[in-house]
Interface confidence: low
């Protein structure tokens, strides 16, 4: 349905608060060194220029596309060359290519302050002074710092954001009430990021058919009871609102997601008893519980698989007729009947299918070719869940930390090229598997382990991507989506690897230690144990948890002392030395 | 919500045609293989014909070969069946579906008697 005003189509859907909040969120992903004043000035002059298009589709430049208008916009800031380099050359461009230029210089790790908390009493009064400020700072600080964010759950965190303060700064005990809603956020801020970061690179590194492979998937295991037609019609729409929220199209994903939600509340009788409680909420609440509602549970007596895709005598036929609806239907069947297994695998299976059928449907007889299919897959099954037995074990026997430091040296061993920031990131994220996982029952474990895994490992192949430093990263993060996980797990040490030089101040401490929380003098610690592992590629568990507890013993030794700053000093020279000598250095 | 509209369907003589139309809405028809299956009086489901979702694929059940013809236009989410010289034998409840599914419509009906 064409508008005469893109523009003002979705100020009138989104209302104002929402087109703002949106435009916002868009102007700090594409350019995230730009000062907080300087996006809400432009903000406010696209809402005035959205508005007299409300008033008059015809006026002058309110038939332009979004793109064009704000592309125009974003090229009006003045120290664009200076802050941004390269990027200012998108402006030379022309639409679509314009956008593309700013997308493709989107920044994962954008060098940014970290952001400190301020005391509850500061941010209780900021809050109170200038709620809306308030509130579109925390828009900005996030967008900026996570560009690939889905802006219309960006709206859900803000609002519980809001929700918190109106709550807590009221409170007694603000701080007790305030700090642990503060944490949940930003954990599961961080969390949405990561997810959506992987739906983003699967959509721009591997193609619209591989995500609408994973929504298949994905939706099948959560609406069993659902029809093909509808978890097709479902995995179309669904693919529609993630290419726009990746593409940069913020507005258009956040209304046509609200028609999503709209749609599968009208339709829930035909997708899932487990809609209802979502369906009842606000709009930004019930797109969000529809996105993390429980699997449905599963028709009963569904038949064999094997009659129609593998004894039927027409699977090759169907096939030819439409390959990636049989395979769609297939993928369909296989996941409503196992939401025991993650996504990923059901992917890999489907592939070994597709695979299977290319080849037999071409042989002299095809049927008695691809009659043990299903044989192939039963390997494919079992190696993720003895690998999630084992590192489930493992960390049971070792708790979250040492897990940790074991993923730690197993990664810095596979890939000690990458560097000791993203490495520590990585294995502290991968070794969080445990306390997610591993307490589920066996039902459970796989889906949430591997799928959580993707994630993960989809971080490192971003951060690696910016900075290309390893081959091996490059061949696991490239050659196959579902297979990455796989293609990390087997890599052995890396023979190749030039041990780097020591340097003795990689491994001098002060008493600034002492003052930071446990998490953060754990990334100490554990930054100082990859950093060890590149030293000596080849020391034992033994010797570096030798190393590692004689290190846990300076820091509490130091951090007791009256003269802590000394202590530092004159024990971490001891410490050094006798590292050098236990570990060969 | 996913919907296919059959029309088209009629009385007529024997040796004469019909064009059968499915309208389809509520899901991307392009990119589905879409299938007309049929249903005598009395008796089951039997397969007509069968359509890829690029067209390039066209296949027909050994009773209607030669005398029907499948066809789509993607664009305005239509599918058809072109059928010549009807037999009495092809009255039946005629369906459109998706893939090779079961029909979830109504259906046309087609009479050929004289």
């Known amino acids: 349905d064409a508008h005469k005003s893109e523009v003002a189509h979705r100020f009138k859907d989104l209302g104002e608060e929402n087109f703002k909040a949106l435009v916002l969120i868009a102007f700090a992903q594409y350019l995230q060194q730009c000062p907080f004043e300087d996006h809400v000035k432009l903000v406010n002059e696209v809402t005035e220029f959205a508005k007299t298009c409300v008033a008059d589709e015809s006026a002058e430049n309110c038939d332009k596309s979004l793109h064009t208008l704000f592309g125009d916009k974003l090229c009006t800031v003045a120290t664009l060359r200076e802050t941004y380099g390269e990027m200012a050359d998108c402006c030379a461009k022309q639409e679509p290519e314009r956008n593309e230029c700013f997308l493709q210089h989107k920044d994962d790790n954008p060098n940014l302050p970290r952001l400190v908390r301020p005391e509850v009493d500061v941010m209780c009064t900021a809050f109170h002074d200038n709620e809306e400020t308030f509130l579109k700072k925390y828009l900005y600080e996030i967008a900026r710092r996570h560009p690939y964010f889905y802006a219309p759950e960006l709206l859900f965190f803000a609002k519980r954001y809001k929700a918190a303060f109106t709550e807590c700064c009221q409170a007694a005990d603000k701080a007790a009430c305030l700090l642990p809603k503060l944490d949940e956020l930003r954990d599961e801020g961080k969390a949405s990021s990561a997810k959506q970061r992987l739906k983003c690179a699967s959509l721009q590194k591997f193609g619209e058919r591989a995500f609408k492979a994973w929504a298949v998937a994905r939706l099948s295991q959560r609406f069993p009871k659902a029809e093909f037609a509808e978890v097709s019609k479902l995995v179309t729409d669904l693919t529609k609102v993630h290419t726009e929220c990746c593409h940069g199209d913020l507005l258009e994903c956040a209304d046509d997601r609200a028609d999503l939600a709209k749609y599968i509340c009208e339709n829930q009788d035909s997708i899932s008893s487990k809609l209802k409680e979502c369906c009842e909420k606000p709009l930004l609440e019930k797109s969000h519980c529809i996105a993390e509602v429980e699997n449905d549970e599963m028709p009963a007596d569904l038949p064999s698989l094997a009659a129609d895709f593998v004894e039927s005598k027409d699977v090759c036929k169907n096939y030819a007729e439409a390959k990636d609806v049989f395979l769609g239907m297939f993928l369909y069947e296989y996941a409503r009947r196992h939401p025991d297994y993650s996504v990923v695998l059901l992917l890999r299976l489907a592939k070994t299918y597709e695979t299977t059928l290319e080849k037999c449907c071409a042989a002299a007889d095809p049927h008695e070719c691809y009659a043990k299919v299903f044989d192939e897959f039963k390997p494919l099954v079992e190696e993720p869940q003895n690998l999630i037995k084992q590192n489930c074990e493992l960390f049971e026997q070792l708790g979250e930390y040492k897990f940790q430091n074991a993923l730690l040296v197993r990664y810095t061993k596979k890939v000690p090229q990458v560097s000791t920031p993203t490495l520590v990131e990585v294995s502290r994220n991968l070794g969080k598997v445990g306390s997610k996982c591993c307490k589920h029952p066996e039902a459970k474990r796989m889906p949430c382990a591997e799928d959580y895994l993707s994630v993960v490992l989809n971080q490192l192949c971003v951060l690696h991507e910016k900075t290309p430093v390893s081959d091996r990263v490059t061949k696991c993060c490239t050659e196959s989506l579902v297979n990455r996980r796989p293609c990390f797990s087997a890599l052995e040490v890396d023979e190749t690897y030039v041990p780097k030089e020591f340097n003795a101040e990689t491994f001098t401490f002060h008493a600034d230690i002492c003052t930071l929380s446990e998490k953060e003098r754990q990334i100490k610690k554990q930054t100082a144990l990859v950093e060890l592992v590149k030293h000596k590629p080849k020391a034992t568990k033994e010797q570096l948890k030798a190393v590692m507890d004689d290190f846990a013993a300076f820091v509490e030794k130091c951090c007791k002392a009256d003269d802590k700053e000394t202590c530092f000093a004159e024990e971490g020279k001891k410490l050094v030395a006798a590292s050098q000598a236990a570990l060969g250095l | 919500q996913v919907q296919l509209q059959e029309s088209g369907g009629g009385l007529v003589q024997p040796g004469g045609s019909l064009r059968l139309t499915c309208t389809a809405s509520?899901?991307?028809?392009?990119?589905?293989?879409m299938s007309w299956v049929r249903q005598p009086p009395g008796k089951g489901l039997e397969w007509v014909s069968a359509?890829?979702?690029?067209?390039?694929?066209?296949n027909y059940a050994d009773s209607v070969k030669g005398r029907f013809t499948i066809s789509r236009d993607n664009d305005k989410k239509m599918l058809y069946l072109e059928m010549n010289k009807l037999k009495p034998e092809d009255t039946a409840v005629y369906h459109c579906?998706?893939?090779?599914?079961?029909?979830s419509s109504q259906g046309t009906q087609v009479t050929v008697s004289s």
């Open positions: 509520g899901f991307a028809f392009s990119s589905f293989g």
């Open positions: 359509i890829s979702a690029d067209s390039s694929t066209k």
């Open positions: 579906v998706i893939g090779r599914g079961s029909p």
